[in-house]
Interface confidence: medium
């Protein structure tokens, strides 16, 4: 059974999970077009399911896309470069997710763009973090 | 429980390279970042850069960009901090990591590399 | 980078006062402050994650508090084993930084 302890270490490496994927949807949002429009015809692959820490193998399988895009948009509307912001999401997901287990990630038929691809994942740690409060 | 053990101390002449070994026991290495750290005698913490060793991915502080190399061998779940082209005023003690978010819960021991003609 | 300011950079104090130590970031770090206490010739310890939280194993006289820039570490009533150099850190961006240290002194 998880302790107190281990509860309040996994909140907040998930609040700061979505403070990044916050901060990257936030960056998007403030493109001027025609960036946005050519970001949003890049297509990532949305989990069928995500509903437990396990599942953010499917996060992180779309990281290197991810990154990807960001590089390819250039922004200054980060403070950490591409990078840097990917690679502290990937140690919060390893750690959050461990590596004792392996787990095959289940996606859904349709794609998604960017924009949803973050808000689904902003939603499920919003959805966790309620869990552990 | 995780333990991080280090290489013994080094005594190296500027213009040297250095490498420092730390090997987990106990525990999972993988999943989480391997970081280095630094402290000159009488001087603070000083970060120098990561490692997260399932995916080989690292990061380093500006400073010491293209003077330190990390890496890490998951078979011996040992990671590695080389230092080149040493100079007096990285006599220090080095020390490597365990963690990010939730602050660094596993060290080293610590190694001291003293940099001497 | 962030820069974290450490205030005092030492103090003298008594065993059972009760000790206060601030530090304070350059931007806003939300909660992602942490606090180490080092001994002489050891590796630094870490006591508080995320500003508040005790890490598992360290005495209750501990305390962190704070968010955004300002955060304070309370121990309540010093005790012998406390004399000691302690840190803050940040680990909300890349590169993670530290406070300059704090001596805990005797009186």
């Known amino acids: 059974a998880p302790t107190s302890s281990s509860t309040k270490k996994t909140q907040l490496q998930l609040e700061h999970l979505l403070l990044d994927l916050q901060m990257i949807l936030n960056g998007i949002n403030n493109y001027k077009n025609p960036k946005l429009t050519r970001m949003l015809t890049f297509k990532f692959y949305m989990p069928k399911k995500a509903t437990e820490l396990k599942h953010l193998q499917c996060l992180e399988e779309e990281l290197k896309p991810l990154e990807e895009v960001l590089n390819l948009a250039q922004s200054k509307n980060f403070h950490l470069r591409p990078r840097d912001l990917i690679s502290n999401i990937n140690v919060i997901v390893l750690e959050l997710k461990g590596s004792e287990t392996t787990f095959m990630c289940e996606y859904a038929d349709e794609t998604a763009t960017i924009v949803e691809f973050l808000n689904r994942w902003i939603t499920f740690c919003q959805s966790i973090i309620s869990t552990l409060t | 429980q995780v333990q991080l053990v280090q290489s013994g101390a080094e005594v190296k002449k500027p213009g040297s390279s250095v490498k420092v070994s730390c090997k987990a026991s106990?525990?999972?290495?993988?999943?989480?970042?391997i970081n280095w750290v630094r402290q000159a005698p009488g001087q603070g913490l000083e970060w120098m850069g990561r490692?997260?060793?399932?995916?080989?991915?690292?990061d380093y502080a500006q400073k010491f960009q293209g003077r330190v190399t990390i890496t890490a061998d998951e078979s011996t779940s040992t990671a590695y901090m080389e230092l080149s082209s040493l100079r007096s005023e990285d006599t220090a003690v080095y020390y490597c990591?365990?963690?990010?978010?939730?602050?660094?819960?596993?060290w080293g021991q610590g190694t001291l590399v003293t940099v001497s003609s | 980078d962030i820069q974290m300011t450490q205030s005092p950079s030492s103090l003298s104090a008594s065993v059972g006062d009760r000790v206060t130590i601030t530090c304070r970031a350059s931007?806003?770090?939300?909660?992602?402050l942490n606090w180490y206490q080092q001994k002489p010739g050891k590796a630094p310890k870490l006591l508080i994650y995320?500003?508040?939280s005790l890490q598992s194993g360290v005495p209750s006289r501990f305390s962190g508090s704070g968010s955004g820039t300002d955060f304070t570490l309370t121990i309540s009533s010093l005790q012998p084993e406390d004399f000691a150099t302690y840190y803050c850190?940040?680990?909300?961006?890349?590169?993670?930084?530290f406070g300059q240290g704090t001596k805990v002194e005797i009186k």
């Open positions: 106990g525990g999972t290495f993988t999943s989480y970042a």
């Open positions: 990591a365990r963690g990010f978010v939730g602050g660094f819960d596993v």
């Open positions: 995320g500003a508040s």
């Open positions: 850190q940040q680990t909300y961006t890349i590169p993670l930084t």
């Open positions: 490692i997260i060793p399932i995916i080989g991915r690292v």
């Open positions: 931007q806003d770090i939300s909660n992602y």
